[in-house]
Interface confidence: low
């Protein structure tokens, strides 16, 4: 903690200005009034404070606002945002996208993924849902940040907003997040023609169920291997060799490259070797010819 001292009269601060860069830590602590600092936060970022001096300023704001900073202060944090922890940010109530933009710009190039994720979460909570303006802001200022939201938060995305999401915004999304987003995307793009629909739905397919993947295989879509590899294992396993060949089109050759990786490996193990051989790719590991396949799960369900 910063040592408490009395402010020398000649060091009294009436304005937040450049003169403060010459103050030692204890002088800043003693001489800067927290309310003045909060009122003139917009000036802080124009002054080249050291990280140590910023620590002092943060400490003063924490004392003034123990329940969390007001948005008028948050908006003008500037580089002081780099000093915030996720725990600090969790106390905030943020509704303005201008605030979000300002802080996303500051965080660029710094290792702040946890803080940014928490900030976005607070914005979604503050605004009540993940609306189009918020999504537009995230895609413009923080590609990939959409995936930092929990599935619960993503569930507040209205289908009408899905069109604003770009493929690169979903690169880091996990299966649980795509499980939430895929049905919304399906709804959002349902009136599009086949090829246009596939282009739009492709980034979301990691959340698609088997029946939808099977349906796509009948539509001449030529799914690329990268997309196929991101499909849910459970969605891929029931597909037949013919369905996979139709689904991938010219990219079916890539199965050879990926034969050791899930979900391709798991899918191969469930196919008859005879069927795999029809692909002409030399895929190995299928069920040998003449073997009888017993689905024990069905038998257990019956007993």
């Amino acid at each position: 903690d910063v040592e408490r001292t009395t402010c020398p009269p000649e060091k009294e601060v009436h304005e937040i200005d450049e003169s403060l860069i010459f103050y030692k830590k204890r002088e800043l602590e003693a001489c800067v009034d927290a309310a003045l600092l909060a009122a003139q936060m917009d000036r802080v970022d124009a002054i080249p404070f050291t990280y140590e001096q910023l620590d002092v300023l943060k400490h003063k704001l924490d004392e003034l606002y123990p329940q969390g900073y007001p948005e008028s202060v948050i908006r003008h944090l500037g580089h002081l945002f780099l000093k915030m922890s996720p725990e600090d940010i969790r106390k905030w109530n943020v509704t303005s996208l201008e605030t979000l933009k300002a802080l996303l710009k500051v965080s660029k190039g710094h290792e702040m993924s946890a803080q940014v994720a928490t900030l976005i979460d607070r914005v979604v909570v503050g605004r009540g849902q993940l609306d189009k303006d918020t999504v537009d802001t995230l895609t413009a200022f923080c590609p990939g940040c959409l995936c930092s939201l929990s599935p619960e938060r993503l569930s507040s995305v209205p289908p009408s907003v899905i069109g604003a999401v770009r493929p690169q915004d979903l690169d880091t999304c996990g299966p649980r997040q795509l499980d939430v987003l895929y049905p919304k995307a399906r709804l959002a793009f349902q009136n599009m023609s086949g090829s246009e629909y596939f282009v739009k739905i492709r980034p979301f397919l990691g959340g698609a169920p088997t029946e939808d993947v099977k349906a796509l295989s009948q539509q001449n879509v030529s799914m690329d291997l990268a997309t196929f590899m991101k499909l849910r294992r459970e969605a891929v396993l029931p597909l037949t060799v013919a369905e996979v060949q139709k689904l991938l089109g010219p990219h079916v050759e890539g199965l050879k490259v990926e034969e050791q990786h899930s979900p391709v490996r798991d899918w191969i193990l469930k196919q008859r070797q005879d069927d795999l051989d029809t692909l002409g790719l030399g895929l190995q590991g299928g069920i040998p010819n003449g073997y009888l396949i017993l689905d024990l799960s069905v038998r257990e369900a019956l007993s």
Partner: antibody, heavy 117, light 113 residues
């Protein structure tokens, strides 16, 4: 040893068609895709398309879609590439190449096709 | 289509010296799931067919001398010949095998200085 032996050089007039053959040996013909790549004189390589010898399915580069046909004869382990409506800019060496995955692991010796009036 | 850009167009290197060829793709060639980069390098000697050197950006084809190595990820790739030999005089091509149509770089001619 894998070998791809292509047919000899051809001279064609503009508007005509050419059919280049590629006889494969030293491996199971139906287990690997066959690609066709061309190279104009002094130029780089251009992928034309590929064919699955097992099913006969072929996929063409859109640039050639309306003019190219790729076929196979499994009984002789031979792949064919036919290019129609020839023009002078089709003068090139045409290669068949067997895939190793998605890359081109083995290449034929090339067939020079000259289009000239 | 994915555009492949090679540099330099030509390169003159002394025997025994290192030769470096760059290849840039207009889209990532990295499959984020398998972490494979779908890029191959070929060597074409004068009057001959191309020959596969490297696939998956860095996996050397069997029989290729270990002075040839590939590196890079995403959109930027490099082929390095650590100690140039007289028999390495050729044109070198990169090729993406990630999306059809598979496309090649324009080629880099390597000569002896």
């Amino acid at each position: 040893e894998v070998q791809l032996v292509q047919s000899g050089a051809e001279v064609k007039k503009p508007g005509a068609s050419v059919k280049v053959s590629c006889k494969a040996s030293g491996y199971t013909f139906t287990n690997y895709w066959m690609h066709w790549v061309r190279q104009a004189p002094g130029q780089g390589l251009e992928w034309m398309g590929n064919i699955n010898p097992s099913s006969g399915d072929s996929y063409y580069n859109e640039r050639f879609m309306s003019r190219v046909t790729m076929t196979v004869d499994k009984s002789t382990s031979t792949a064919y590439m036919e290019l129609s409506s020839l023009r002078s800019e089709d003068t090139a060496v045409y290669y068949c190449a067997r895939s190793g995955g998605l890359w081109l692991a083995f290449w034929g010796q090339g067939t020079l096709v000259t289009v000239s009036s | 289509d994915i555009v492949m850009t090679q540099s330099p167009d030509s390169l003159a290197v002394s025997l025994g010296e290192r030769a470096t060829i760059n290849c840039k793709s207009s889209q990532t060639l990295l499959n984020s799931v398998s972490q494979n980069n779908y890029l191959a390098w070929y060597q074409q000697k004068p009057g001959q067919s191309p020959k596969l050197l490297i696939y998956f950006a860095s996996t050397r084809e069997s029989g290729v001398p270990d002075r040839f190595s590939g590196s890079g990820s995403g959109t930027d790739f490099t082929l390095t010949i650590s100690s140039l030999q007289a028999e390495d005089v050729a044109v070198y091509y990169c090729q993406q095998h990630y999306r059809t149509p598979y496309t090649f770089g324009g080629g880099t001619k390597v000569e002896i200085k």
